[in-house]
Structures are given as C-alpha cells and as structure tokens.
C-alpha cells in the first residue's frame, strides 16, 4: 500500500480494508487479521464480530465488512443486526421469564416468537364468528347474523390445522 496524501487530511485517500496508520507516518496499512474497515479514511480498523455460543455465522468477516450472525436452530434474532438470540416457542405459546407458556384462553400466537394476542372481536365489526379461535389461530369472522339465511349456524367446527409457520390469509 503506497503512502498517499491529500491537501486536507492525509488519511482521506486510504480505501476501505485499510487504515491510516499513526505508527507509520499515516500510510495506508491493510487491516490486521480479524478486523475490517468498511469506509475509507479510517484511522483504525474495527474488530470483527464473533458469532459464538447461540449465535452462528451467517456471513464471514472480510477486510471491508463485519461478520453477520444469526441464531442456532431453536432460537431467533432480536434487535438491530441480530444483537440477541431469543428462544423459540411452539405456536400457541409465548416466552415468559419462566419459559414457554401456553396462550391463555381468548388469545393466540401463530408464530414461534412474539406474544399471545387476543382473538379478534367479530362483533365490533358487526360480524359473527365463523370459525372458533384456538391457541394457535385467530377466530375467523363471517357475515353479520342478519346476513345469514334462516336456520344457518354462525359457528362451524374448527378448521383443520394448517402447516406450522403459515398464518391465515
């Protein structure tokens, strides 16, 4: 790497993947192993993120970009850039301080993460319950009771379980 200078900042010509080395009269030196600089003109390289424990490497560190992590099976990412991994639960459960707990009656969770949410209140929209809710599924609202033909029931048996990971359309 050749020493480069500009009229303003001698470091401004150092490209990504290098740093402007104080210890060598501000020449552009390559980033040491396990470090990177994603922009030019840096006075130092940043330490590469290490994906350890519950984290696993999604993208290796290079001299110009940091490593990216995701979570091992049974966990999912939380926070910007997957800063934390949180335990998965089953559909129909939510994660509490004491671990995975089933959704209370009247609530559901159709994912392996997040909290249990209340079933939709069909009557607020002037509709009736077409399909009962479960721990894993929201209720399905149907036409309003007035729209139903005489003798028709507004409640049908629960729909057959869908494949995990698919939420109602």
């Amino acid at each position: 790497f050749e020493r480069t200078r500009s009229l303003q900042d001698p470091c401004s010509n150092c490209p990504a993947g290098t740093f402007c080395d104080n210890n060598r009269n501000q020449i552009c030196s390559p980033c040491p192993p396990n470090s990177f600089s994603s922009a030019g003109g840096q006075r130092t390289c940043d330490i590469c993120r290490q994906c350890k424990g519950v984290f696993r490497t999604r993208k290796e560190c290079s001299s110009t970009s940091n490593a990216e992590c995701d979570c091992t099976p049974g966990f999912h990412c939380l926070g910007a850039g997957c800063s934390m991994c949180e335990q998965d639960c089953k559909q129909g459960q939510e994660l509490t301080k004491k671990g995975c707990k089933d959704c209370c009656f009247g609530t559901f969770n159709d994912q392996k993460r997040g909290i249990c949410r209340p079933w939709t209140n069909c009557s607020l929209d002037g509709k009736s319950v077409l399909v009962n809710g479960t721990k894993e599924r929201d209720v399905v609202c149907g036409p309003s009771p007035a729209d139903l033909s005489p003798g028709a029931s507004s409640v049908t048996p629960p729909a057959p379980a869908r494949e995990p990971g698919h939420s109602p359309q």
Partner: antibody, heavy 120, light 107 residues
Framework: QVQLQQPGAELVRPGTSVKLSCKAS????????INWVKQRPGQGLEWIGN????????NYNQKFKDRATLTVDKSSTTAYMQLSSPTSEDSAVYYC?????????????WGQGTSVTVSS | DIQLTQTTSSLSASLGDRVTISCRAS??????LNWYQQKPDGTVKFLIY???RLHSGVPSRFSGSGSGTDYSLTISNLEQEDIATYFC?????????FGGGTKLEIK
C-alpha cells in the same frame, strides 16, 4: 496469557547508560507494537516511543529522541530501551507496554515497571 | 503535542457512589481516547478504548463517553477495589500523550 516481564530495579551512575529489558510471552511478539512509558515519582505518564518487532520500525517522542534507543531481540522475544547519559531527571519507573490490535492506539498490557535510580 | 488535562487531581467518594472523572484535550481527538487504572502498587490496567469500549474483563460499572475535546470515565457503583489513580491517553496523533491523572480516594 500475555505477560511483559521487567526487572524490578536498576541503579545507574550519572553520565553512563542503562539498557532496560522487557521479556514478552503469551502472544505473537512480532505482531504487536511495544511502547515505553516513563513515570516520575508521584507524577503522570510520558510516552517515550514504540517499536514494531517484525520490522523494527520505531517512533520516538521528540523529547526522548536523542537519548532513548529502542531495539528488540526476536529470538528471545525481548524488547530493550537504552537510555544514554542519564541524569537525576531520569530517575523514574519505566513501563514497557503492548499496543493492542487492531490499532485504537491504546496499550492493552503493561509490564510491572522497572524503577531506575540515577545516583552516584 | 496534544495536551490532555484532568482538571481534578484527586477525588473523594463513598462506596456505592457514582463517580465521574473528566479529561479535556487541547484539540479534537475524534474519540481516540483511552482510560487506564493505576493501583497504589504501580500496577496498570487497561479499562476503556476508543472513548466508550470496555476492554475484555473490565466490570460493566465502568463506562466512558465524550466526543471532540471533552471525555469522561464513569464508575457507576464505587467498590473498594476501584481505589486507584485514573489516566486518560490520546491515540489520535503522535506523540501519544497522557492526562495528569485523577486519584480516587474513599471518604
């Protein structure tokens, strides 16, 4: 683990010279800068200079440039600082330190320091 | 050379206190500010680099902040083992320079 071993004390006659040693272990000696720092009794810290053992590139604080010489022996992973024509002003503790990697220009490990007394 | 000024040379605090030590640079040092702890026996430990990044193994009660010319080290819950002298150091420009130190004592 990283260690920088320095002798505890050195007694030096004024006008002579003294060569302080710093034995490094627990890491790749040639890959990190060695810095030397001076501390007079009850006072602050002064950076003397540094050396990169791989190619022996050195930087000096102008204040010490004429009298301090930094060298290394790669085979024994030892760094040296020679101080010529010492006076009572040079009586101090001298620390050898390792500069961290990547370079935030911070020293991450310090030796115990060598107490130098200049006296006739 | 860049001068670093630690205006408070000594500081008295009680165990459990939150303590802040300041360091001012004579010019903008772009966050290249590091902190060290020196125990009474002369042992020096590296605490914080690049203004706010904790060195491995340093307790989380230590934190650093600042920008431009003004920087500080905070100890959130003072413990007996924190009694020491604290030095700042700039890594922006050669020659690297240190502050004069702030000696922390127990009330």
């Amino acid at each position: 683990q990283v260690q920088l071993q320095q002798p505890g004390a050195e007694l030096v006659r004024p006008g002579t010279s003294v060569k302080l040693s710093c034995k490094a272990s627990g890491y790749t000696f040639t890959s990190y800068w060695i810095n030397w720092v001076k501390q007079r009794p009850g006072q602050g810290l002064e950076w003397i200079g540094n050396i990169y053992p791989s190619d022996t590139y050195t930087n000096y604080n102008q204040k010490f440039k004429d009298r301090a010489t930094l060298t290394v022996d790669k085979s024994s992973t030892t760094a040296y600082m020679q101080l010529s024509s010492p006076t009572s002003e040079d009586s101090a503790v001298y620390y050898c330190t390792r500069m961290g990697d990547p370079f935030y220009y911070a020293v991450d490990y310090w030796g115990q320091g060598t107490s130098v007394t200049v006296s006739s | 050379d860049i001068q670093l000024t630690q205006t408070t040379s000594s500081l008295s605090a009680s165990l459990g206190d939150r303590v802040t030590i300041s360091c001012r640079a004579s010019q903008d040092i772009s966050n290249y500010l590091n902190w060290y702890q020196q125990k009474p026996d002369g042992t020096v430990k590296f605490l914080i680099y690049y203004t706010s990044r904790l060195h491995s193994g340093v307790p989380s009660r230590f934190s650093g902040s600042g920008s431009g010319t003004d920087y500080s080290l905070t100890i959130s819950n003072l413990e007996q083992e924190d009694i020491a002298t604290y030095f700042c150091q700039q890594g922006h420009t050669l020659p690297y320079t240190f502050g004069g130190g702030t000696k922390l004592e127990i009330k």
